[in-house]
Amino acid sequence: VSITKCNSDMNGYCLHGQCIYLVDMSQNYCRCEVGYTGVRCEHFYL
């Protein structure tokens, strides 16, 4: 899977994680920090 960094406009999109762009799927994706979940890593689950 080809990935790259999200565009600058997506800075802040992932609240507790890193935004990556999945080139082959044409999708932005939040890779959440441990303990966080949700589309934008907005939920703390521990």
């Epitope: 565009n7 600058s8 406009d9 802040g12 999109y13 609240l15 762009y21 080139v23 044409s26 999708q27 932005n28 994706y29 589309v39 934008r40 907005e42």
Partner: antibody
């Protein structure tokens, strides 16, 4: 399926304000940014600004700063764009556009006519 | 703000011709450019995103390329149904549209 349904056409007098709504269904606007784009008759596309409904943060194109207000009501899954001090040059179709995880998905557009 | 300079503003070509439209950004946009087609009375239709990724259902005669500040959109063999106005959009930093290119048949 995902949808953005905008409010109906408006006719306003110069100097008045207009508020256009954009109701989302099939997805949560908190997972997205909502952008607003307009197109005057026979003219090109013009980005106006956007809101991050989760953080309640807005960014506006400089030329609209102070005249446009973009808001979002996450309880009703609806975004709004209010433009004040209307002039004839603001006659245009106004589009809301979802961005975020996937690339842009557009509403059907709302025609705003400014005429005395 | 990033500026997008699109050229030409209009062009006339024959059916079967190769058509090329260019957009130049005022700074590096890291391939974050999309191309839209708009026909009169219709909302814009997304053709390409991330420089060269064709949207599902878009004919393969449409393509995009480029990097840094210079980007190209190509119709390899112009068809009558391609008559429309085409816009580039940078989405690296907020959003800026190019001025549009009106494509007509000779």
């Amino acid at each position: 399926q995902d949808q953005l349904v905008q409010s109906g056409a408006e006719v306003k007098k110069p100097g008045a304000s207009v508020k256009v709504s954009c109701k989302a269904s099939g997805f949560n606007i908190k997972d997205t940014y909502i952008q607003w784009v307009r197109q005057a008759p026979g003219q090109g596309l013009e980005w106006m600004g956007r809101i991050d409904p989760l953080r309640r943060q807005t960014k506006y194109r400089e030329k609209f700063e102070g005249r446009v207000t973009i808001t979002a009501d996450t309880s009703t899954n609806t975004a709004y764009m209010e433009l004040s001090s209307l002039r004839s040059e603001d006659t245009a179709v106004y589009y809301c556009v979802r961005s975020g995880r996937e690339f842009d998905y557009w509403g059907q557009g709302t025609l705003v006519t400014v005429s005395s | 703000d990033i500026q997008m300079t699109q050229s030409p503003s209009s062009l006339s070509a024959s059916v079967g011709d190769r058509v090329t439209i260019t957009c130049r950004a005022s700074q590096d946009i890291h391939k974050y450019i999309a191309w839209y087609q708009q026909k009169p009375g219709q909302a814009p239709r997304l053709l390409i995103q991330y420089t060269s990724t064709l949207q599902p259902g878009v004919p393969s005669r449409f393509s995009g390329s480029g990097s840094g500040t210079d980007y190209t959109f190509t119709i390899s063999s112009l068809q009558p149904e391609d008559i429309a106005t085409y816009y580039c959009l940078q989405y690296e930093q907020l959003r800026t549209f190019g001025g549009g290119t009106k494509v007509e048949i000779k």
